[in-house]
């Protein structure tokens, strides 16, 4: 019960981390115009990955996209880069973990299959959550450097009548908002991964050997060897003195991926 | 046709107050910023107030902030501009003025007159 | 806030005339957003309100007659018309959009000879 519930958390929470990514990778509003020193503007600029934005106080706002590729920073083709593939880890991890949902039952999958569906989809959101919180802190590195280097450059050649004001930018909405959703994926996803030891079975399946020894007969159990998962008891090699007679577990056990013959 | 008229206008004793009225018509008015521009008895212009579409943001003279206040009234398709503690200098022709695109007054009314004597 | 300087004062034209004025700002009027400077031209008779000629110191405003043409940017901008007739006998009035407070220039007086 607790696995299902880790699981679904899990998928729940990076399924809004993943909505986040693809709302903040949108959004406009990666950098907007530092007010510090003009609070009152009448002609407010922000920008976004593919597109820069002014916004009037008369209401109307025109927007226009980056239409080159080999002019724009290479900082900014990383950041894109870094978006897309965490939206596209992400999206392919959603995938994934919706067949891997212990709750739904496709066909007679077995739960081996689940945990390693599981344990996929709980990578690709961890690493889908660490792309969109690279993403949102280079661009965010980009922006303190910018915005030193124009506080620079304000204060220099001021010296004749005529001032040029210089457009400063600070962080915009999306970066919080990237910064929290690459969080609730990397969070959803380590919630997947733990889920996945749960799935896994608790006890291998096979049955004891029977070896007839003359004098009195001893079966010997081989145990199965599993990653310690932190959940059930833990696996014991059983020696079970039982005048020959096969035996079974106590405890009942699924086919697992860590069961060898 | 878009139409801007101004009322409320009047002669004050200083430190009285006034508060003039546009009424708007020919237009959305709840889509638009509005603002209220004088001209001084010398011809010169001066931009006094503006209140944004969605009356999130009120801009105002630094002459006339905590004295003046700019409000709207989108059901009646009204402007208003409430002036208190008047001063000679607020004397002047007070219009209503539409903003377009670049911020740009479009519209003007044909304005109402305060003089402000005593 | 920003000083919006006209010159000059008043020009006396025969009609026919190519005229050009000036405005100056105390800073520059340019946003590096879109590139677009943020002044405008208005055109006042006597008795009436301004008139919007031109916005973004060279958009005509719909229904404004092409001798008006405005150039110029960050600080220096001009009002150009070529073949001033009797009814461009006027008073011109440049204004800084930018930032607040939205401030006009001493306005330039047109005056037929």
């Known amino acids: 019960m607790a696995v299902t519930a880790c699981q679904g958390l899990g998928f729940v929470v990076s399924l809004i981390g993943i909505a986040g990514i693809i709302a903040a990778t949108c959004m406009d509003q990666w950098s907007t115009q530092d007010l510090y020193n003009n609070p009152v503007t009448a002609v407010f600029n922000y920008q976004g990955l593919w597109r820069s934005c002014v916004r009037e106080s008369s209401g109307f706002t025109e927007c226009r996209g980056y239409f080159t590729l080999l002019g724009l920073p290479a900082m900014l083709q990383a950041v894109r880069a870094l978006m897309i593939v965490g939206i596209v880890l992400g999206a392919i991890g959603l995938l994934v973990s919706i067949f891997a949902l212990k709750c739904i039952r496709i066909g007679s999958m077995e739960d081996s299959a689940k945990a390693n569906m599981t344990l996929t989809s709980g990578i690709m959101f961890i690493v889908s959550g660490l792309c969109a919180i690279a993403g949102v802190s280079v661009f965010a590195n980009m922006l303190v450097t910018n915005f030193w280097m124009s506080t620079a450059n304000m204060y220099t050649g001021m010296g004749g009548m005529v001032q040029t004001v210089q457009t400063r930018y600070t962080f915009g909405a999306a970066l919080f908002v990237g910064w929290v959703a690459g969080g609730l994926t990397l969070i959803g996803g380590v919630m997947m991964c733990i889920a996945c030891r749960g799935l896994a079975p608790e006890e291998t399946n096979y049955k004891a050997v029977s070896y007839h020894a003359s004098g009195h007969s001893v079966a010997y159990k081989p145990g199965g060897f599993k990653a310690s998962t932190g959940f059930g008891s833990n696996t014991k090699n059983k020696k079970i003195y039982d005048g020959g007679a096969r035996t079974e577990d106590e405890v009942q056990s699924y086919p697992s991926k860590h069961d060898y013959v | 046709d878009v139409n801007l008229v101004e009322s409320g206008g009047g002669l004050v004793k200083p430190g009285g107050s006034l508060k003039l009225s546009c009424a708007a018509s020919g237009f959305t008015f709840s889509s638009y910023t509005m603002s209220w521009v004088r001209q001084t008895p010398e011809k010169r212009l001066e931009w006094v107030a503006t209140i944004t579409y969605g009356r999130i943001y009120t801009y105002y003279l630094d002459s006339v902030k905590g004295r003046f206040t700019i409000s709207r009234d989108n059901a009646k398709n009204t402007l208003y501009l409430q002036m208190s503690s008047l001063r000679s200098e607020d004397t002047a022709m007070y219009y209503c003025?539409?903003?377009?695109?670049?911020?740009?007054?479009?519209?003007w009314g044909l304005g109402t007159s305060v003089t402000v004597s005593s | 806030d920003i000083v919006m300087t006209q010159s000059p004062s008043s020009l006396t034209v025969t009609a026919g005339e190519k005229v050009t004025m000036s405005c100056k700002s105390s800073?520059?009027?340019?946003?590096?957003?879109?590139?677009?400077?943020?002044l405008t031209w208005y055109q006042q008779k006597p008795g009436q309100p301004p008139k919007l000629l031109i916005y973004?110191?060279?958009t005509r405003e719909s229904g404004v007659p092409d001798r008006f043409t405005g150039s110029g940017s960050g600080t220096d901008f001009t009002l150009t018309i070529s073949g001033v007739q009797g009814e461009d006998l006027a008073v011109y009035y440049c204004q800084n959009d930018y930032s607040y407070p939205l401030t006009f220039g001493g306005g330039t007086k047109l005056e037929l000879k």
């Open positions: 800073q520059s009027l340019l946003n590096s957003g879109n590139q677009k400077n943020y």
């Open positions: 003025t539409r903003m377009i695109t670049g911020n740009a007054m479009d519209s």
């Open positions: 973004w110191a060279s």
